[in-house]
């Protein structure tokens, strides 16, 4: 007990009434109004509790404190009086704060601030939406990926900040009357090939594709080394030149010079130059054969190989080049006697006759074109008298049956060996290179030097042999009739042809030599 009459054991937040009793301080309460034992406690009264008599008024919040309370304006409101806290509704001067006026950048870009009681909202501009994680921030709506599919399928959607565009895809253009950009844009494929908007090299043909185009090598051309075919940047070279080189293993200055000219022509070649290029090649060949130079010093076998290589390559080159000629008949002749006759036509149903100084060729147009080949039909005949120099002493290989027949009617091959070339060597070719088995035969009429009496005249072709060289052969060719200076031959394939006089001694009149013409 306190001598002054005040209890010393009063619990926290209470004061003594007398020596034996205590009372809770204002703002605190205990189980009974007067505390008589130290076991009792004083607890804070929450004046802000719902059942409390305290009323702070509108736009305000009650904040409980230890032993008391404060009234404060709610967020978004402020007291007109300037007093931060107050105790009851009569002291309440809270009014709405206009955050939009206070801070014009509140909604950042692309949004308009709208004041609300106690707060504000951001109203996004068209093409923007509130960010879910930050409802005060307007972010661009990507109309292209939002699943709205705002554009026509012929266009592609381009998202812009706050908007979008429907643009024609590359290689497409707006249909007549359509804009290019708004959501009502409708497009159609541009035919770059026919409109001339392509950038195909002249060595290629333009092919339109949906929304684009490609450049394919012309027939008889191939992509330059390392460049793929069928691309926009494809550049091609004429196959007919790129691989016509001297035969590996044959070394001749004259031949090298000829092939250097051929390669130069190939490098500068454009389809429009086909006519000139053909003439230049034949001119070069004519000059080569007129003055063979060191070719004549090569061993005979090598000379035959060179002739074989020249005949083979010439046929390929002329076939390739003639596909780029316009329809009609061409005739060229050169000083040393080389002659070319060429007819180019769209497929026609008739026979064709090509006439030259020393040879005439007759065949059916239908042979000329391979089925499914879109190009023009070409029939060509080249007379190459100069080739005879290189083919001197070339062997003749007869089929066993013909060999036997000759042995029956002739005494056999005389000792002086190789047959004599009576005619010019001619080479026949078609746009169709599959000419090993013609559906109807080709007829050749050769003019040639006189036949020595009692000698066998044979229609022959040059067979490119196993060793890349070759020999004369008669397979598939028959002699229809012969006179002193002309012979008619009929063959079931195309190649290079000639009339030979074989050194057989005719024992009796040979019915084969009877003139049928």
């Amino acid at each position: 007990q306190d001598s002054r009459g005040c209890a010393r054991w009063c619990p926290q937040d209470s004061s003594c009434v007398n020596a034996t009793a205590c009372r809770c301080n204002p703002g605190f309460s205990s189980f009974s109004e007067i505390i008589t034992t130290p076991m009792e406690t004083c607890d804070d009264i929450n004046e802000c509790a719902t059942l409390s008599k305290v009323s702070c008024g509108k736009f305000s919040d009650c904040w409980n404190t230890e032993g008391s309370y404060d009234c404060v304006c709610s967020p978004g409101y402020e007291p007109v009086s300037g007093a931060k806290t107050f105790k009851n509704e009569s002291e309440n001067t809270c009014q709405d704060v206009d955050e939009c006026q206070q801070n014009p950048r509140l909604c950042k870009s692309y949004g308009t601030c709208v004041n609300t009681l106690g707060s504000y909202t951001c109203q996004c501009l068209p093409g923007f939406k509130l960010k879910p994680e930050d409802p005060k921030l307007c972010t661009d709506v990507n109309e292209c990926t939002s699943g709205q599919n705002p554009c026509h399928s012929s266009t592609h959607c381009l998202n812009n900040v706050g908007s979008y565009q429907c643009r024609c895809r590359p290689g497409w253009q707006p249909i007549p009357g359509s804009p290019n950009g708004p959501n009502n844009t409708v497009c159609e494929d541009v035919d770059e090939c026919s409109s001339g908007q392509h950038q195909c090299d002249s060595s290629t043909v333009c092919f339109n594709t949906v929304g684009s185009y490609s450049c394919r090598c012309r027939p008889g051309w191939k992509p330059r080394h390392g460049i793929p075919n069928n691309q926009k940047d494809t550049v091609c070279e004429d196959m007919t030149f790129s691989t016509w080189t001297p035969p590996p293993g044959v070394h001749s200055q004259t031949l090298s010079r000829f092939f250097d000219k051929v390669q130069d022509l190939g490098r500068d070649y454009k389809p429009g130059l086909a006519n000139n290029t053909i003439q230049s090649i034949l001119q070069a060949l004519d000059e080569l054969l007129e003055a063979p130079g060191d070719l004549e010093t090569l061993p005979r076998l090598q000379q035959h190989c060179v002739a074989s290589h020249l005949l083979d390559g010439l046929e390929d080159v002329l076939r390739g080049l003639s596909k780029n000629l316009s329809n009609g008949l061409l005739n060229f002749s050169y000083p040393a006697g080389t002659e070319l006759s060429l007819e180019v036509q769209k497929q026609v149903d008739r026979s064709v006759t090509l006439r030259q100084n020393q040879a005439v060729m007759q065949l059916d147009w239908n042979q000329a074109q391979k089925s499914g080949d879109p190009g023009p039909s070409v029939v060509g005949l080249v007379s190459i008298p100069g080739m005879g120099k290189l083919l001197a002493e070339a062997p003749l290989v007869l089929e066993p049956e013909k060999q036997m027949l000759l042995h029956e009617t002739h005494q056999g091959l005389l000792q002086d060996g190789s047959p004599i070339l009576l005619s010019d060597v001619i080479s026949a070719f078609l746009s169709n290179n599959d000419t090993q088995n013609l559906s109807s035969p080709v007829t050749f009429t050769f003019s040639h030097r006189s036949v020595i009496p009692r000698q066998k005249v044979l229609c022959v072709f040059w067979e490119h042999g196993q060793n890349g060289c070759g020999h004369w052969a008669t397979t598939g060719c028959s002699t229809i009739g012969t006179r002193d200076t002309s012979t008619i031959c009929r063959c079931t394939h195309l190649s290079s042809f000639a009339v030979l006089m074989a050194h057989y001694d005719v024992q009796e009149e040979d019915p084969v030599l009877t003139v049928i013409t």
């Epitope: 196959m239 691989t243 016509w244 080189t245 001297p246 035969p247 590996p248 293993g249 044959v250 070394h251 090298s256 076998l301 090598q302 190989c305 083979d312 390929d316 490119h464 042999g465 196993q466 060793n467 890349g468 060289c469």
Partner: antibody, heavy 120, light 107 residues
Framework: EVKLVESGGGLVKPGGSLKLSCAAS????????MSWVRQTPEKRLEWVAT????????YYPDSVKGRFTFSRDNARNTLYLQMSSLRSEDTALYYC?????????????WGQGTSVTVSS | DIVMTQSQKFMSTSVGDRIIITCKAS??????VDWYQQKPGQSPKVLIS???NRHTGVPDRFTGSGSGTDFTLTISNVQSEDLADYFC?????????FGGGTKLEIK
């Protein structure tokens, strides 16, 4: 016995030069055309050059034309391949080979090869 | 350039089998094609020249055929020592070009 022995290979920087040699024995060297053929690290074979028996004709693919020079010394029975402006794609094992008589132009004898590496 | 294509990069066979390796030229090369065998760690060696001529000392189980654009090398009665890479080569025109090679594996 026909024998071809290459030498002169090694490591060289891009743009650098190297001279390969091929010593021949056991045959009439001056009667045969000869070639260099290389084998890339991926095992592809590539023809590099050919020289005629007398040495007055040489042939090259576009990939080496103007950079490589093939020559021969028939008195010494030796071939030379002078390589300049070397590129990484020239990295290979280089073989010299003898050609059979034309028109059978097969390469009937090959050396063991010399390795060339072009790298920085 | 004439492209020589060996479409089979690898071929697997057993001793005693017959196998055909093919080579296709991008254009007519007549018969100017050779076949070469390269055993591991060795230089190439000619087997066949001019498409079908077996070279001296080459066993007769190796046969070459073809002309124009399609060529084949046939190995009948394959032996374990035939494990090698096989290359075709054309010498019809310059540049001389090889096929990419076919690796023969023996099971």
């Amino acid at each position: 016995e026909v024998k071809l022995v290459e030498s002169g290979g090694g490591l060289v920087k891009p743009g650098g030069s190297l001279k390969l040699s091929c010593a021949a024995s056991g045959f009439a060297f001056s009667s045969y055309d000869m070639s260099w053929v290389r084998q890339t690290p991926e095992k592809r074979l590539e023809w590099v050059a050919t020289i005629s028996s007398g040495g007055n004709y040489t042939y090259y693919p576009d990939s080496v034309k103007g950079r490589f020079t093939f020559s021969r010394d028939n008195a010494r029975n030796t071939l030379y391949l002078q390589m300049s402006s070397l590129r990484s794609e020239d990295t290979a094992l280089y073989y010299c080979a003898r050609h059979y008589d034309y028109p059978d132009y097969a390469m009937d004898y090959w050396g063991q090869g010399t390795s060339v590496t072009v790298s920085s | 350039d004439i492209v020589m294509t060996q479409s089979q990069k690898f071929m697997s066979t057993s001793v005693g089998d017959r196998i055909i390796i093919t080579c296709k030229a991008s254009q007519n090369v007549r018969t100017t094609v050779d076949w070469y065998q390269q055993k591991p760690g060795q230089s190439p060696k000619v087997l066949i020249s001019l498409a079908s001529n077996r070279h001296t000392g080459v066993p007769d189980r190796f046969t070459g055929s073809g002309s124009g654009t399609d060529f084949t090398l046939t190995i009948s009665n394959v032996q374990s020592e035939d494990l090698a890479d096989y290359f075709c080569l054309q010498h019809r025109n310059y540049p001389l070009t090889f096929g990419g090679g076919t690796k023969l594996e023996i099971k």
